[in-house]
């Protein structure tokens, strides 16, 4: 899939598909971003699955697991995002991948992303209507660090 | 900043500015756009060392702590793209903060994320020609994470 | 072509767990979501969740979170539904279906195009 | 959770009917609904998405329209293998509902 976009151009304005812009026979999904919402995440924990496995994906063998949870919105670019939950408080114990150690604590790696909402833009009506696409800047939980706990000074 | 695209389109098409699209005061150039870090850049590099600090950003305090890399491409879109380099192979200790410990390994979460390069579109030639966007996926690394070494069946 | 093939029906006491699979073929498996519906005897469709293959991203109803766990090998193109704490309301057909997506980019359209044959669950003392 | 709310619950038809169902949802949807067939002791099977998108391989006769909150699915001719439960189902917001069936029968 090629955007096309004019040297100087302002911003991507009215789509106007050309004959030579043909669609592909199947979408590259815009969606698999990962991002999380704007709202603080609630850190459900899950005792039965608070351990770091020796195998499987990187999130599962984690000393500070996490799980990804679907954020899906029709109207947003990307439509699917994607935000790591922490399945632990606390580091688990690398002797055992079980026991949690009070001395590490998992904690969110938050990063602010860019999205775009379509709305109806200002004046446009009828079924061929175009979309504005807002720019939002969208809170991203990317994974779970185990780090040690911030001291005061 | 608003992106206008038409209800059913393909794909973002060319860029055609129209009279109704007047343009803003300041443009947020899509080339200019810069992604900056999910954690704040420490500029004092204590951080370049294999330790886990009780302070500052959360790559420092990680106990599979990284520093941030620039990756600058002005034909890219984002422009600047941060890449996590683990400081330290294996996990450093939650109790010194600077020993390392063998049963866990520092290993980089990676992502493929869609990035956009700009090309001259095929057949447009003069001082306002327009230019492609072609859709890619970029290995770019978000963090460190301290993990139970894979276990092999 | 397309095919979704289930385990075979399970009789479990109330309390006890069930781990349901579902075997994609004709596909690319990590491309596209897995659905979980359920459907009681003489009953309506009611939704469970769904699961990404690629990065095991879940979305569950609020009524099964904590006791829908699903998961999915990508070695072998299966998914999995497990659900704990069985009672006897949970007696139901259980479908895996394929979300499949649809129209243009960026903004597709999402339907469950190809489903599992269905996996009767009972659950009797 | 968007509640979808179908009727009738059940209707007997002759062959060669038309025959419409609609769907309610408990918000706008924005057009964001699909409708599935199923016949007895078999998985439901897809035919319409996005309210009037016919899926590969479903017969014209089928077709569906609406907006908003308020959808209809339209069977122009009935034909004997149509004797199924219908179900809508919103993809607008997760989690995803079915309206409650309807269940058609010949007459």
């Known amino acids: 899939v090629s955007l096309r976009i004019q040297e100087g151009c302002s911003h991507l304005p009215s789509c106007c598909p050309s004959k030579e812009q043909e669609p592909p026979e199947e979408w590259l999904k815009w969606s698999s971003a990962s991002v999380s919402p704007p709202e603080p995440l609630s850190h459900t924990h899950h005792a039965e699955s608070c351990r770091a496995s020796k195998d499987g994906p990187l999130n599962s063998r984690a000393i500070s697991p996490w799980s990804y949870e679907l954020d899906r919105d029709l109207n947003r670019v990307p439509q699917d995002l994607y935000h790591a939950r922490c399945l632990c408080p606390h580091c688990v114990s690398l002797q055992t991948g079980s026991h949690m150690d009070p001395l590490g604590n998992s904690v969110p790696l938050y990063h602010n992303q860019t999205v775009f909402y379509r709305r109806p833009c200002h004046g446009e009506e009828g079924t061929h209507r175009r979309y504005c696409l807002e720019r939002r800047l969208y809170r991203v939980s990317l994974a779970c660090v185990c780090v040690r706990p911030r001291v005061m000074a | 900043v608003s992106l206008r695209i038409q209800e059913g389109c393909s794909h973002l098409p060319s860029c055609c500015p129209s009279k109704e699209q007047e343009p803003p005061e300041e443009w947020l150039k899509w080339s200019s756009a810069s992604v900056s870090p999910p954690e704040p850049l420490s500029h004092t590099h204590h951080a370049e060392s294999c330790r886990a600090s009780k302070d500052g950003p959360l790559n420092s305090r990680a106990i599979s702590p990284w520093s941030y890399e620039l990756d600058r491409d002005l034909n890219r879109v984002p422009q600047d793209l941060y890449h996590a380099r683990c400081l330290c192979p294996h996990c450093v200790s939650l109790q010194t903060g600077s020993h390392m410990d063998p049963l866990g390994n520092s290993v980089p979460l990676y992502h493929n994320q869609t990035v956009f390069y700009r090309r001259p579109c095929h057949g447009e030639e003069g001082t306002h020609r327009r230019y492609c966007l072609e859709r890619r996926l970029y290995r770019v690394s978000l963090a460190c994470v301290c993990v139970r070494p894979r276990v092999m069946a | 072509q397309v095919q979704l093939v289930q385990s075979g029906a399970e009789v479990k006491k109330p309390g006890a767990s069930v781990k349901v699979s579902c075997k994609a073929s004709?596909?690319?498996?990590?491309?596209?979501?897995m659905n979980w519906v359920r459907q009681a005897p003489g009953q309506g469709l009611e939704w469970m969740g769904l699961?990404?293959?690629?990065?095991?991203?879940?979305s569950y109803k609020q009524k099964f979170q904590g006791r829908v766990t699903m998961t999915v090998d990508k070695s072998i193109s299966t998914a999995y539904m497990e659900l704990s704490r069985l009672r006897s309301d949970d007696t139901a057909v259980y479908y895996c279906a394929r979300e499949g997506y649809y129209g243009p980019s960026p903004f597709h359209h999402y339907a469950m195009d190809y489903w599992g044959q269905g996996t009767l669950v009972t659950v009797s003392s | 959770d968007i509640q979808m709310t179908q009727s009738p619950s059940s209707l007997s038809a002759s062959v060669g009917d038309r025959v419409t169902i609609t769907c309610q949802a408990s918000?706008?949807?924005?057009?964001?609904l699909n409708w599935y067939q199923q016949k007895p002791g078999k998985a439901p099977k897809l035919l319409i998405y996005y309210t009037s998108t016919l899926h590969t391989g479903v017969p014209s006769r089928f077709s569906g329209s609406g907006s908003g909150t308020d959808y209809t699915f339209t069977i122009s001719s009935l034909q004997p293998e149509d004797i199924a439960t219908y179900y809508c189902?919103?993809?607008?917001?997760?989690?995803?509902?079915f309206g409650q069936g309807t269940k058609l029968e010949i007459k």
């Open positions: 699961i990404n293959p690629d990065n095991g991203g879940t």
């Open positions: 004709g596909y690319s498996f990590t491309g596209y979501t």
């Open positions: 189902q919103q993809y607008s917001k997760l989690p995803y509902t």
């Open positions: 918000q706008d949807i924005s057009n964001y």
